[in-house]
Interface confidence: low
């Protein structure tokens, strides 16, 4: 037989706390134990679960755990079943809630001298006792026309008066604990002797010299007083008006009228109502003077036919905010259609050429009206007046290519040369009418030119080929003065180009024929071995049939090219001593010698007392200093050629002689000793 060793028993439990219903069973065979709640099997959850044979509660819940629990033991082999005694919880709890109006039905019905009942929605088991508070101060029964019982959750105010106004809250406590109202109730019962607003003044905006009216009314029993003040607290009455409010009138109903308003009347007006009791009520309203600023200028607009475009009109700053509308040809635009106004925008849909013209944006308010025009151009695709033609241009002269077009607006013309955009410079110039000028035509200008004429509506283009008529010229012109080295082979070239290949020949300027050792080979003058007699003036003549002939004069000089007889050597000198850098050159014409020291030419007229260049070309530096160290270059030149050679100069401290060294010991390096 199945025997219950421990049976569950009814017990007190606290909401949200732990609890345990015990059940222990003894039986001959294996049994399984489960629990019933009001006859239905109990499913395990995290909150309520079987612990062995007992039922454990992690947190008692007054709603889910109310009812009768029973422990059931069953032998699945024999089918025998035993049930324990019933057990239930006496759950103690308390739960906060709001303070609500029970009577009358709505706040709007609360009047002075009516009964008001408030209810405290705090519930619990066992039944809690209640405490009421007004503005945080506890209320006790029988004081100041109210009824409250600690057992009752209701607070009755009979009759309710202004002195009962305040924030009502409640708290309740029981054996379980304490809770206070989750939402409180504000009771507001007006004192009829307090001033109340009936009509409040509103801000107004008026134009200069117009009139402004502020309305203001209060009510109370007995009737309240009403006073108007301006900005600086100056009272306004019909008897005493401040100097700047001479045109103010206060009416019996409290309204304030200001006539012929001026800028100094703008500001804050205060209407003050004062009842027999209670604080004054101060209402403020501002008088603004209407104003309107100027409108920004429009840039002219260019649109293309068939497109949709919008022009935004920025309204000027103003008070009140200006209204905006668009007009065209004196007619206000509609709010729909093909050309219409949308908000502040002018909308042109599917633009036609006839839409071009002046459109005006108007803005207006109480202060006045402003307007601004925008000029709208409807662009057309350019058409040709004169296309560029294939042209023959003469080398060295200015050349012109036309590109004359017409369109609205005036088209922009750009030129391309070999598909490369021509940027205007000293050689190219594009005139306003589109014509291209090539200032001085060169051979390589012979190529393809293309002009493109554009407006926002589209572009057209045409191209032309330029052929350059080449002039007869030396390429390059021979140098007018040339040198030949004595006793050596020499050549003097001369070449020319023209529309036809020119023939080239040399002759002596005096008309005499060339010696047999001098040959003229296709324009190159060749000297097999230069003699002194070969010096003189020669003329190169280039000619062809259509262009005639041209001449170039060349003066040939025979020279012995420069060689150095003496070259400067690497030199080391003691500080304070004298350095000598020798240099001697020969040649015909006799070469001149210049020195360059530390990257600058040494001007013989500006050398100073320490330096001197001798007639033979040598350079002497007295009293040398460390800063004189560096590379020195000897440059030899005449009218025919130039040569240079260089050597370093080192300036060193004179060593102090050691004991062991005799007076005749040589220095440790090659020195100039002076």
């Amino acid at each position: 037989a199945i025997v219950f060793i421990k049976q569950p028993s009814s017990q007190d439990a606290l909401q949200g706390r732990r609890a345990l219903l015990r059940c222990e069973v003894e039986a001959p065979g294996p049994v399984h134990v489960y629990w019933l709640l009001d006859g239905a099997p109990v499913q395990d959850t995290e909150r309520r679960f079987a612990q062995g044979s007992s039922l454990s509660f992690a947190a008692v819940d007054r709603l889910q755990d109310s009812g009768t629990f029973q422990c059931v033991a069953r032998d699945d082999v024999t089918g025998e079943e035993a049930r324990s005694a019933n057990a239930s919880f006496n759950i103690k709890w308390i739960e906060a809630g709001p303070v609500v109006l029970k009577h009358p039905a709505s706040e709007a019905e609360i009047q002075p001298q009516t009964q008001v009942t408030l209810r405290c929605h705090i519930d619990g088991h066992p039944r809690p006792t209640y405490q009421w508070f007004r503005d945080g101060t506890p209320l006790s029964d029988g004081q100041s026309n109210h009824t409250v019982s600690s057992k009752e959750r209701n607070l009755t105010l009979r009759p309710a008066g202004p002195e009962h106004s305040g924030l009502y809250s409640c708290c309740a406590h029981s054996a379980f604990g304490q809770a206070c109202s989750s939402q409180n109730f504000t009771l507001s019962i007006a004192d009829e002797s307090f001033a109340r607003v009936v009509l409040a003044p509103q801000d107004v905006v008026v134009a200069r010299y117009e009139e402004a009216m502020f309305h203001c009314q209060f009510s109370a029993q007995p009737p309240p007083s009403l006073q108007w003040l301006f900005e600086d607290e100056t009272p306004i009455t019909n008897r005493s008006r401040p100097p700047h409010l001479r045109r103010a009138t206060v009416f019996a109903n409290g309204s304030l009228l200001l006539t012929q308003v001026r800028p100094r009347n703008a500001g804050i007006y205060r209407c003050i109502g004062q009842g027999q009791r209670g604080p004054p009520i101060i209402l403020e309203a501002t008088l603004h003077l209407a104003e309107i600023e100027d409108m920004p200028l429009f840039e002219p607009r260019v649109f293309t036919a068939g497109s949709e475009e919008r022009v935004t009109c920025l309204p000027p700053k103003g008070l009140p905010e200006p209204s905006v509308w668009w007009e065209h040809a004196g007619v206000r635009l509609p709010t729909h259609g093909r050309v219409y106004q949308k908000g502040h925008e002018l909308v042109l849909a599917n633009i036609a050429e006839s839409d071009a013209g002046v459109y005006t944006c108007h803005a207006a308010n109480l202060a006045g009206q402003r307007r601004q025009d925008v000029n709208i151009t409807v662009a057309t695709v350019p058409s040709w007046l004169k296309k560029p033609q294939d042209s023959q241009l003469e080398e060295g002269k200015p050349g012109y290519l036309d590109c004359l077009t017409q369109a609205t607006p005036k088209p922009t013309v750009v030129w391309y040369r070999n598909q490369m955009l021509i940027s205007e410079d000293s050689r190219f110039e594009v005139f306003k009418n589109g014509t291209l000028r090539i200032n001085s035509v060169e051979v390589y200008d012979g190529t393809w030119y293309r002009c493109m004429s554009s407006t926002p509506a589209g572009s057209i283009e045409a191209q032309a080929r330029v052929q350059v008529l080449e002039k007869l010229k030396f390429t390059p012109p021979p140098q007018p003065q040339q040198c030949m080295e004595f006793d050596k082979e020499a050549t003097v070239p001369c070449s020319a180009t023209g529309r036809e290949k020119p023939t080239i020949k040399w002759e002596r300027a005096d008309g005499s024929s060339l010696p047999e050792w001098v040959t003229d080979n296709a324009g190159t003058l060749h000297f097999a071995r230069v003699t002194r007699d070969d010096a003189g003036n020669y003329t190169c003549i280039a000619s062809n049939g259509p262009q005639g002939q041209i001449r170039a004069h060349v003066q040939l000089t025979v020279a012995v090219f420069i060689t150095f007889k003496v070259e400067p050597e690497r030199t080391t000198v003691y500080q304070g001593h004298t350095a000598l850098l020798q240099c001697e050159a020969q040649g015909d014409p006799k070469p001149l010698i210049q020195w360059k020291g530390k990257d600058r030419i040494l001007d013989p007229t500006k050398l100073g007392p320490r330096m001197h260049i001798f007639q033979n070309g040598s350079l002497v530096i007295h009293d040398v200093a460390p800063e004189d160290s560096g590379r020195y270059t000897c440059i030899a030149g005449n009218s025919c050629n130039i040569k240079h050679t260089e050597a370093p100069l080192y300036v060193v401290d004179k060593p102090v002689p050691e004991e062991s060294e005799g007076p005749g010991s040589p220095p440790p390096y090659k020195m100039i000793q002076t």
Partner: antibody
Framework: QVQLQESGPGLVKPSGTLSLTCAVS?????????WSWVRQPPGKGLEWIGE???????NYNPSLKSRVTISVDKSKNQFSLKLSSVTAADTAVYYC????????????WGQGTLVTVSS | EIVLTQSPATLSLSPGERAALSCRAS???????LAWYQQKPGQAPRLLIY???RRATGIPDRFSGSGSGTDFTLTISRLEPEDFAVYYC?????????FGQGTKVEIK
């Protein structure tokens, strides 16, 4: 005060046509306002679809222009949106809104209706 | 079309802090033609600011707008719990009307 209410099927098949209507209450569709459609794909931003005036004038977003038709029915005080050749990318909450008569901000808006494009 | 770029994409702040939301336009927008909207999950956008700086009816004065040209800012001086939402800027000065991609203001 003007209130707007969208209505129409919540599910449209791909390549089909999405059709929505916006009923205007508390004011006349013949006022000087323009009436717009705006959409918002799930978890994304807002995209303006187009607008209509009571005369029938329309403006559309160029990105949708080829597929959108907005019409107005003054007798019923409502305006409608048709979007053809829909794909899953057209799945969105569709809002109707009134544009301010002097400027073009949107206020008020309808509460929006979710349209899903799926087979 | 005018592209509006909002930054940051997300702003994590605590109630009581100040929020500054940026909206940058790809080309100049007249200040008369920029609006800000607030959108909470499952709701339609709500107009906050129009004309770049004018508060719509019933909008608390902790919301303010500023800016001109290509740079505009929406400032919330002290964040209240109900201000955590997504904010969009919109230009209505040229067609098509365009919106920014939104800035989400979330609780830190």
């Amino acid at each position: 005060q003007v209130q707007l209410q969208e209505s129409g099927p919540g599910l449209v098949k791909p390549s089909g046509t999405l059709s929505l209507t916006c009923a205007v209450s508390g004011g006349s569709i013949s006022s000087t306002n323009w009436w717009s459609w705006v959409r918002q794909p799930p978890g994304k931003g807002l995209e303006w679809i187009g607008e209509i005036y009571h005369s029938g004038s329309t403006n559309y977003n160029p990105s949708l222009k080829s597929r959108v038709t907005i019409s107005v029915d003054k007798s019923k005080n409502q305006f409608s949106l048709k979007l053809s050749s829909v794909t899953a990318a057209d799945t969105a909450v569709y809002y109707c809104a009134r544009e301010d008569s002097n400027y073009d901000w949107f206020d008020p808006w309808g509460q929006g209706t979710l349209v899903t494009v799926s087979s | 079309e005018i592209v509006l770029t909002q930054s940051p994409a997300t702003l994590s702040l605590s109630p009581g802090e100040r929020a500054a939301l940026s909206c940058r336009a790809s080309q100049s927008v007249s200040s008369s033609y920029l609006a800000w909207y607030q959108q909470k999950p499952g709701q339609a956008p709500r107009l906050l600011i129009y004309g770049a700086s004018r508060r719509a009816t019933g909008i608390p004065d902790r919301f303010s707008g500023s800016g001109s040209g290509t740079d505009f800012t929406l400032t919330i001086s002290r964040l209240e719990p109900e201000d955590f939402a997504v904010y969009y800027c919109q230009q209505y000065g040229s067609s098509p009307r365009t919106f920014g991609q939104g800035t989400k203001v979330e609780i830190k």
